[in-house]
């Protein structure tokens, strides 16, 4: 999906109002210095591409993020403010239901969410630069 035509201001507002709080809640008990940020992004569409990938694509050591509250809110935000995004999710939703797994917060998942926080902050910074 090409995130170029999204309403970035609206996405930022949703992130600051609610998604960020859920990400921070997920990370509670860990320090920001516990993990190194290894994933970056260069512009707003690129940031959203990386955020989508890290949030919804299961990895061998962290398969359960898509069911977290911050992930559900991220999906809702993208569906709302990115033209045509929702139709790309119809088949993806069915696949996700089939592979639902037991919810376990592993250290690898914490590391992945730490990366997500970094990507979101980068998204906000690139938005501020444009303004």
């Amino acid at each position: 999906y090409d995130f170029t035509n999204c309403d970035f201001q609206k996405i930022e507002a949703d992130y600051l109002r609610t998604i960020s709080k859920d990400l921070i809640t997920y990370m509670s008990g860990t320090k920001s210095t516990d993990f190194n940020n290894t994933v970056s992004c260069s512009n707003r569409p690129h940031c959203l591409t990386e955020i989508q990938s890290l949030t919804f694509n299961p990895t061998p050591r962290c398969a359960s993020l898509a069911k977290e509250m911050f992930a559900r809110k991220t999906k809702a935000t993208l569906a709302l403010w990115c033209p045509g995004y929702s139709e790309t999710q119809i088949n993806a939703t069915q696949a996700m239901k089939k592979r639902r797994k037991r919810k376990v917060t592993t250290n690898k998942c914490l590391e992945q969410v730490s990366q997500l926080l970094g990507l979101w902050r980068r998204f906000i910074r690139t938005l501020l630069k444009k303004q």
């Epitope: 949703d14 609610t18 999906k75 809702a76 045509g84």
Partner: antibody, heavy 120, light 107 residues
């Protein structure tokens, strides 16, 4: 089963406000946005706006900006639509309709409609 | 704002005939079009979503097709209960909009 039950018919004077409620049952309220659509007598469907409980955000059609407020009480699974500064051309049936925000993405269940009559 | 134009405005047909309803978008919207049926005094009812996806409980005589800017709702053999008004709607981008409707009436 999924049900959306709207409040009863209203008669209002021009310049007044109306608040229509829509009580949802049979599904997880925060998994869906609540959209509001109106239909003037003998006319087509007109999208007014939406409130998304999951994100606590709303979006309105340009035509209604500044005159409409959509909210929800998640504790009672009830959505509200308030329209202010009513005019005679606001006479219409007002519908609420749910739409999935993390799946389905379509208005698959509708309320029965609330007739709002604006007359002096 | 995406404008949807439905045609014809009214379709006069007999039971058993085939109905073809058209919906044209003012800009490409991929497959983000849904079709609703509305009978007098009733709320709209979803028939087809994302251009061609069928809904459980909706008779299979209803089908949808199209992508981009041109979409079609087909009723293969009209039953007496199919005479109603049909609306297309786009959810490609906000504000979501409806077509003006096509009335399918008995000839």
């Amino acid at each position: 089963q999924v049900q959306l039950v709207q409040s009863g018919a209203e008669v209002k004077k021009p310049g007044a406000s109306v608040k229509v409620s829509c009580k949802a049952s049979g599904y997880i309220f925060t998994d869906y946005a609540m959209h509001w659509v109106r239909q003037a007598p003998g006319q087509g469907l007109e999208w007014m706006g939406t409130f998304i409980p999951l994100l606590d955000t709303s979006d309105y059609a340009q035509k209604f900006q500044g005159r409409v407020t959509m909210t929800a009480d998640t504790s009672t699974s009830t959505a509200y639509m308030e329209l202010r500064s009513l005019r005679s051309d606001d006479t219409a049936v007002y519908y609420c309709a749910r739409m999935g925000v993390t799946h389905s993405y379509v208005m698959d269940a509708w309320g029965q409609g609330t007739l709002v009559t604006v007359s002096s | 704002e995406i404008v949807l134009t439905q045609s014809p405005g009214t379709l006069s047909l007999s039971p058993g005939e085939r109905a073809t309803l058209s919906c044209r978008a003012s800009q490409p919207i991929s497959i983000s079009v849904h079709w609703y049926q509305q009978k007098p005094g009733q709320a709209p009812r979803l028939l087809i979503y994302f251009a061609s996806q069928s809904i459980s409980g909706i008779p299979d005589r209803f089908s949808g097709s199209g992508s981009g800017t041109d979409f079609t709702l087909t009723i293969s053999r009209l039953e007496p209960e199919d005479f109603a008004v049909y609306y297309c709607q786009q959810t490609f981008s906000l504000p979501y909009t409806f077509g003006q409707g096509t009335k399918v009436e008995i000839k």
